[in-house]
Interface confidence: low
């Protein structure tokens, strides 16, 4: 079970899953991606208070000293656990080609 | 090769693995480990600026969109690419027993 | 020494438009998120904005009408402010943040420079 | 936008009294909140942050608690540099809340 999965901010304001929707010239891959011409890009965002969603001891650590330590140790970010592979059509010297690309689209978040 | 690793801040601005000294007061840890009493922390901390370390697809993304809509999409972050094992010696009801730990120690830092 | 100092403040007519300087000196501007603050006279504090690495935000009032920005060439971070009103006489501060986790605590500041908005 | 409530907005206290200001903000803000001191024609000067995390080189007989909406600083035995104005204010930023003020709390000599 993930660790502090409620968070004190109130619904929605911890790290969690969201999306936004960004353009091919939003990313810069107009030249170099056809299809899709819109993606919506799930990504990582919100606050990492004290022990929510830790990724792991490191995080655990990292929460204790930033309290000590605030001018030297940052607090954990929230940043993706895991991603899904997306397709996108790219173009070549010779026309287009498929590419899949697995570490695109955050699955789940933690904090690390 | 690893995308971006000069960093435009200056020397040792961007992120990169530094070493914070803690004792297991700091770190909550007095109640249940008898050794280290002090641990030397490897950490990822600094600044992640347009493509320095950026680990993959997701983070370049991210990048693009935290320069389009600053308010809604944060930069990337910096964080452990990889671990070091670290062996804790821990009280237990017994006496002690020896416990590593894969996830405790930062290795490699990268921007995600 | 840390240091920031503030200039650019005096008399402007409302409707007018100001630029605020706050020269960093004893460290790095480009390394840390900075904030304005400001303070009507016998007021309290109140939240202009803040610059990170690579955006800014704002508080609701400030939107449209005041851009934050430096110039990391010279260590100096800007407030540019248009369509003054009288109610925007106040000392404008510039903080630097003191570390930039999920909180923005202000440890550093300047001495302010007074805006007075008046016809 | 979080609006921050301090209360009282000022109060009359002797040398040695124990102070207590109290912040509450309009939304559930964790821990992220930071407490300032002015005093007059100076800038402020952070006391604490993350609620409970004393500022390099402030007197321990300051401290700070709360978590949440409410908040409280307290000034153990209030010595004669500690009258001053004190302001609380929220961090917390991430979804371009922005970080607002309280109104003051200003600590007078009786």
């Known amino acids: 079970a993930r660790n502090g999965d409620h968070c004190p901010l109130g619904p929605g304001r911890c790290c969690r899953l969201h999306t936004v929707r960004a353009s091919l010239e939003d990313l810069g891959w107009a030249d170099w991606v056809l299809s899709p011409r819109e993606v919506q890009v799930t990504m990582c965002i919100g606050a990492c208070p004290s022990q929510f969603r830790a990724a792991n001891m490191h995080a655990q650590i990292k929460t204790s000293l930033h309290r000590l330590k605030p001018d030297t140790v940052p607090a954990p970010c929230c940043v993706p656990a895991s991603y899904n592979p997306m397709v996108l059509i790219q173009k070549t010297d010779t026309g287009v080609s498929l590419q899949t690309y697995d570490d695109l689209l955050a699955k789940d978040c933690h904090c690390i | 090769a690893r995308n971006g690793d000069h960093c435009p801040l200056g020397p040792g601005r961007c992120c990169r693995l530094h070493t914070v000294r803690a004792s297991l007061e700091d770190l909550g840890w007095a109640d249940w480990v008898l050794s280290p009493r002090e641990v030397q922390v490897t950490m990822c901390i600094g600044a992640c600026p347009s493509q320095f370390r950026a680990a993959n697809m997701h983070a370049q993304i991210k990048t693009s969109l935290h320069r389009l809509k600053p308010d809604t999409v944060p930069a990337p972050c910096c964080v452990p690419a990889s671990y070091n094992p670290m062996v804790l010696i821990q009280k237990t009801d017994t006496g002690v027993s020896l416990q590593t730990y894969d996830d405790l120690l930062a290795k490699d830092c990268h921007c995600i | 020494e840390v240091q920031l100092v503030e200039s650019g403040g005096g008399l402007v007519k409302p409707g007018g438009s100001l630029r605020l300087s706050c020269a960093a000196s004893?460290?790095?501007?480009?390394?840390?998120?900075m904030s304005w603050v400001r303070q009507a006279p016998g007021k309290g504090l109140e939240w202009v904005g803040m610059?990170?690495?690579?955006?800014?935000t704002y508080a609701t009032w400030a939107k449209g009408r005041f851009t934050i920005s430096r110039d990391d060439s010279k260590n100096t971070l800007y407030l540019q402010m248009n369509s003054l009103k009288t109610e925007d006489t106040a000392v404008y501060f510039c903080?630097?943040?003191?570390?930039?986790?999920?909180?923005?605590?202000?440890?550093?500041w300047g001495q302010g420079t007074l805006v007075t908005v008046s016809s | 936008d979080i609006q921050m409530t301090q209360s009282p907005s000022s109060l009359s206290a002797s040398v040695g009294d124990r102070v207590t200001i109290t912040c509450q903000a309009s939304?559930?803000?964790?821990?992220?909140l930071s407490w300032y001191q002015q005093k007059p024609g100076k800038p402020p000067k952070a006391l604490i942050y993350?609620?409970?995390i004393l500022a390099s080189g402030v007197p321990s007989r300051f401290s700070g608690s709360g978590s949440g909406t409410d908040f409280t600083l307290t000034i153990s035995s209030l010595q004669p540099e500690d009258f001053a104005t004190y302001y609380c204010?929220?961090?917390?930023?991430?979804?371009?809340?922005?970080?607002?003020f309280g109104g003051g709390t200003k600590v007078e000599i009786k």
């Open positions: 903080a630097r943040v003191v570390y930039a986790g999920w909180t923005y605590p202000l440890g550093i």
């Open positions: 004893g460290f790095s501007l480009s390394n840390y998120y």
């Open positions: 610059i990170s690495f690579s955006g800014t």
């Open positions: 939304q559930s803000i964790s821990s992220v």
């Open positions: 993350e609620a409970s």
């Open positions: 204010q929220a961090n917390y930023d991430v979804y371009n809340y922005g970080n607002p």
